[in-house]
Amino acid sequence: QQQTLPKPFIWAEPHFMVPKEKQVTICCQGNYGAVEYQLHFEGSLFAVDRPKPPERINKVKFYIPDMNSRMAGQYSCIYRVGELWSEPSNLLDLVVTEMYDTPTLSVHPGPEVISGEKVTFYCRLDTATSMFLLLKEGRSSHVQRGYGKVQAEFPLGPVTTAHRGTYRCFGSYNNHAWSFPSEPVKLLVTGDIENTSLAPEDPTFPADTWGTYLLTTETGLQKDHALWDHTAQNLLR
């Protein structure tokens, strides 16, 4: 006999990276017939929603009108059908951005390199932080973490044309509070090679990460990320 219901999906709209003072909606999708949804923040009950009519609704939304560092952290949700509770969802890491300062991103030897050349990004932020994050735009976005007192190095190793793209970095004051994004740096990789087995090894990031972040900051448009694999947020853990 089943003791728990399948875990719900949890995600943030328009994005889990939220500029401070902007709004964000945390969505929890369970099953039709669920009479109650609970949102937990950092292990404690944060909000409750009871959909009406439950048999016609399988998703609830928890609205945060004004993002700040106190609201940033790990969220999860559960739902109930009758007396039976679900497994908790995966953890959603909600990050507040545009905190304090703007880092500077540079790339050595330069923004234009030859296939196979060793490339290193440098993210610098003079305020007190020790963790940095490098993000690459695009559908197959990548993220890397780096550490340093005022500057972190992100060695990409020998690059291929797969590394072409636009990069930005953040300083991280803690796992869930990030700086303003750096100005973008566009990496161009030229040169035809026979051996194309070299490929980036950093973990994959959800599709259109940066495009969606820009939607958040510039237009406030919303985009449904229900189909995202939010386990990619493991980069924060």
Epitope: P109, G110, P111, P158, T160, D192
Partner: antibody
Amino acid sequence: QVQLVQSGAEVKKPGSSVKVSCKASGYTFSEYTMHWVRQAPGQGLEWIGGISPNIGGTSYNQKFKGRATLTADKSTSTAYMELSSLRSEDTAVYYCARRGGSFDYWGQGTTVTVSS
Amino acid sequence: EIVMTQSPATLSVSPGERATLSCRASQSISDYLHWYQQKPGQAPRLLIKYASQSISGIPARFSGSGSGTDFTLTISSLEPEDFAVYYCQNGHSFPLTFGQGTKLEIK
């Protein structure tokens, strides 16, 4: 210490080819791209192109594309620059230079004279 | 192609004096600008990388500044061995391009 040692001076006829070598030592050859720069008598510096020895990626100045061929032999830590269809204007000193961000180490130069 | 323009073409300065050499890029190259010194019959030698970063073994009298399109190489107090030709180089985009050079001569 890092050293780039180039082959000796060459005198060539117009229309022929020349191949200049650059043997690297004192560092891991495959970890840096090798570039070629030339300097005509009394003139400035002109970039020909560069090669990544580890996987053979190349980039050329459009001016030399089709005439210059850059290769590298990892087993001997040697880079090569071959220039074909030589003309008198190709008379110059040819340098190899390691790109460690900037061109941090240079060969001593190879004088190529093109004369009929 | 990014065009690098150096000025002046020739600079006459007395030993012990300060020399200021300029380099301008035809479009922004951030700080991807390198300076080289070349003496007759010798290969160029790296002096300054990334606009202002000093190089081990290069005397402290050599310094660089600038970002974007305008850059300066300063030699604070000229020594006799500093009289040579100086080149700036675009390290931002291919083709990698050099300025035409500034000849620093004894006044």
